[in-house]
């Protein structure tokens, strides 16, 4: 009769390497009497005998995982116990090996030049796959802008046009290589003007061609604006070559104007726009001054103190030796002439003269004056001061108002810019906006077509000049 013998594991468990979906077997050979009961654990949790993913044979000495999954990684132990002595245990690891697999492949991307692009490429595999990228037919080299992240994703800083193309990621380990599908990186470029239209100073009736060239991805469209409105006359010719659009506007010049070329392209739901402007002036209309040069300062005089906006900077023209004194003297002279006019006319005329002589400063790089809007000038001339204006013109023609420096500083309305063409290019007279409500009788000279901002203010079709003139015709 055999003597009882405590269990001894004669073949300890070893580390087993297994590929996903393949079979993995642990052997636990035990000598003992009586025959032991063998149980198995994975990560200290008992493997149930009826778990169909496992096969336990040879009296429990053979554990087979029928189709390895990556989640089967872990420590497997066999425990043998026959009631004689203590239970014995042997453990070994299962290392699940896995060919590379791309779990989050890259997708097509549209990106605006200068931004950051990230193409995802998340992988699985054991050993951990290394990830590289191919652009077109060539391996992609990393540099200060282009990097493959720890996650495998490709990050491109400050995307450039030349980054556009087809990309795929490659995941590689000792067991194999996986390739993603080809994806497209499209680089969109904001519309940009390469060649701005040039300004022209021409004689009345000349033909002028304004040329504007723009680039962008997608190719931009070009539109032209004349004094704030879509160009109504003139012919436009366009050509496109290598993402560059060239637009030529031919004009027959009968009046001065500000022409703006607008290049636009679309990026998703958003648009990008670039603008460039040119002036076309008519030679005889330009007022010969010191290039309209001067400086901006707060008004420190007395005459217009109640009329001008308190915080506004006004333009002082260095054509005068001492601009602030000279302009104050001019307005002072004009003020005396206004004493005899009607109560309706006087405050309107004061507002006009002060804002004409002390024009609001335009906020560009170089200080320039912002003239009064034509509509307000006409309102004073043809509405508030119709009788006085006619009388003043008569006196002016007879030379009665001539001083040593200038005629009185009354603007020529027809040469002022219209607020309907560009509301930012001229100054409004708030006094007239307020007072117009109280006027019920309009002179017959008033246009029947109301202006947009001031009901019944005269709207003129006259041309305008870039700089106002100190004359009264």
């Amino acid at each position: 009769e055999k003597l009882p013998k405590a269990p001894v594991i004669t073949t300890p468990l070893e580390t087993v390497d297994a590929l996903v979906e393949e079979v993995a077997t642990f052997m636990c050979a035990v000598e003992s009497y009586p025959q032991p009961e063998i149980s198995w654990t994975r990560n200290k949790i008992l493997i149930k005998l009826f778990d169909t993913r496992y096969s336990i044979r040879e009296n429990g000495q053979l554990l087979t995982i029928l189709s390895v999954e990556d989640s089967d990684d872990g420590i497997y132990c066999c425990i043998a116990n026959n009631g004689v002595g203590g239970a014995v245990e042997s453990c070994g690891a299962l290392q699940v090996k896995m060919k590379p697999k791309i779990t989050r492949p890259p997708i097509n991307v549209k990106i605006i030049e200068g931004l950051k692009a990230v193409l995802p490429c998340t992988t699985m595999g054991n050993p951990k796959p290394s990830v590289s990228w191919i652009k077109g037919d060539n391996a992609l080299r990393e540099n200060s802008r282009i990097a493959v992240l720890e996650s495998g994703s490709l990050r491109i800083h400050n995307v450039q046009k030349e980054d556009a193309g087809q990309y795929r990621c490659v995941a590689k380990n000792s067991l194999g290589t996986a390739y993603s599908k080809l994806v497209k990186l499209e680089v969109e470029v904001f519309a940009r003007i390469l060649r701005a239209p040039e300004s022209h100073n021409v004689t009345f009736g000349s033909f002028v061609t304004l040329r504007c060239t723009a680039i962008g991805i997608p190719v931009p469209t070009i539109s032209w604006i004349e004094n704030g409105n879509a160009v109504s006359s003139g012919s436009i010719q366009e050509s496109v070559k290598d993402r560059v659009i060239d637009s030529r506007l031919q004009l027959f010049i009968t009046k001065p104007g500000l022409y703006t070329c607008i290049a636009t392209n679309k990026h998703g739901e958003k648009f990008s726009t670039a603008k460039a402007a040119a002036t076309v002036s008519i030679a005889e209309w330009s007022k010969s001054q010191k290039d309209s040069q001067g400086y901006c300062a707060q008004y420190r005089g007395e005459v217009c103190d109640a009329v001008l906006a308190k915080d506004a900077l006004v333009f002082f023209n260095t054509s005068y030796r001492d601009p602030e004194d000279a302009q104050e003297l001019l307005i002072h002279t004009a003020w005396n002439e206004l004493k005899a006019v009607s109560p309706l006319c006087r405050p309107a005329a004061e507002a006009l003269l002060c804002n004409h002589l002390f024009q609001e400063c335009s906020p560009g790089v170089v200080p320039t004056p912002m003239p009064i809007c034509r509509e307000y000038c006409l309102a004073v001339k043809e509405l508030f001061c119709a009788k006085e204006w006619q009388a003043m013109e008569g006196k002016a023609h007879r030379g009665l108002y001539r001083s040593g420096m200038h005629l009185l500083p009354v603007p020529e309305c027809s040469k002022l810019p219209s607020m309907h063409r560009d509301p930012t290019a001229c100054t409004r007279l708030p006094y007239l906006d307020y007072k117009k409500e109280n006027i019920t009788t309009f002179p017959s000279i008033t246009s029947s077509r109301p202006s947009a901002d001031i009901p019944n203010l005269p709207a003129s079709t006259s041309s305008f000049a870039v700089s106002p003139a100190y004359s009264m015709t």
Epitope: K290, D291, Y295, A297, P363, G364, V365, P367
Partner: antibody, heavy 121, light 107 residues
Framework: QVQVQESGPGLVKPSQTLSLTCTVS??????????WSWIRQPPGKGLEWMGV???????YYSPSLKSRTSISRDTSKNQFSLHLSSVTPDDTAVYYC?????????????WGQGTQVTVSS | SYELTQSPSVSVALRRTAKITCGGD??????TQWYQQKPGQAPVLVIY???RRPSGIPERFSGSNSGNTATLTISGAQAEDEADYYC??????????FGGGTHLTVL
């Protein structure tokens, strides 16, 4: 009182792009009636204006540098920047940023202390 | 481009009058600015719009501009006025131009 201060690398290699930033304190770069220029001074030589960015973001460049110069701004940081591409040793200079003011006929009434940039391999 | 011409150097005796000129085609039709620069320092605006002095600039600095010449005048030059002086204009295309600079020596 507005103050301007330049910052950027002191050494740039030929053919690279020089990038400098000007930080403005005590006033906004979007304030009307002001503009912001870059001006440089090569060693032992005179001042050379490079370009300007206006309060509304519009830019103008010196004709001789136009093809290589770009000025941009970051209004959230109250900064504007100069980018000069394809530099050569001739671009070695002290670079100043300066404010132009309509109150003084667009003269430059506030200057940075200047930053020395050397172009050398 | 627009060219501004300055003579490289001008000398003046202490407390005498110094005149520094800046030549340019029809410069009288443009506003001229003048800057003073001392060694190792940034330039400082001394005259703008031909003849106007910013606050803090001594009265001895004055300017004029007509025809093809703009002039910076320092009446009663002081030792601390020794520096480089640059003229500056804006052209109608929004380009700024500087003269080549004049070094003023106060003897």
């Amino acid at each position: 009182q507005v103050q301007v201060q330049e910052s950027g690398p002191g050494l740039v290699k030929p053919s690279q792009t020089l990038s400098l930033t000007c930080t403005v304190s005590g006033g906004s770069i979007t304030a009307r009636y002001y503009s912001w220029s870059w001006i440089r001074q090569p060693p032992g030589k005179g001042l050379e204006w490079m370009g300007v960015i206006a309060y509304d973001g519009s830019t103008y460049y010196s004709p001789s540098l136009k093809s290589r110069t770009s000025i941009s701004r970051d209004t959230s940081k109250n900064q504007f920047s100069l980018h000069l591409s394809s530099v050569t040793p001739d671009d070695t200079a002290v670079y100043y940023c300066a404010r132009g003011s309509s109150r003084v006929a667009a003269a430059f009434d506030s200057w940075g202390q200047g930053t020395q940039v050397t172009v050398s391999s | 481009s627009y060219e501004l011409t300055q003579s490289p150097s001008v000398s003046v005796a202490l407390r005498r009058t110094a005149k520094i000129t800046c030549g340019g085609d029809n410069i009288g039709s443009k506003n001229t600015q003048w800057y003073q620069q001392k060694p190792g320092q940034a330039p400082v605006l001394v005259i703008y719009a031909d003849s106007r002095r910013p606050s803090g600039i001594p009265e001895r600095f004055s300017g004029s501009n007509s025809g093809n010449t703009a002039t910076l005048t320092i009446s009663g030059a002081q030792a601390e006025d020794e520096a480089d002086y640059y003229c500056h204009v804006w052209d109608s295309s929004t380009n700024a131009w500087f003269g080549g600079g004049t070094h003023l020596t106060v003897l």
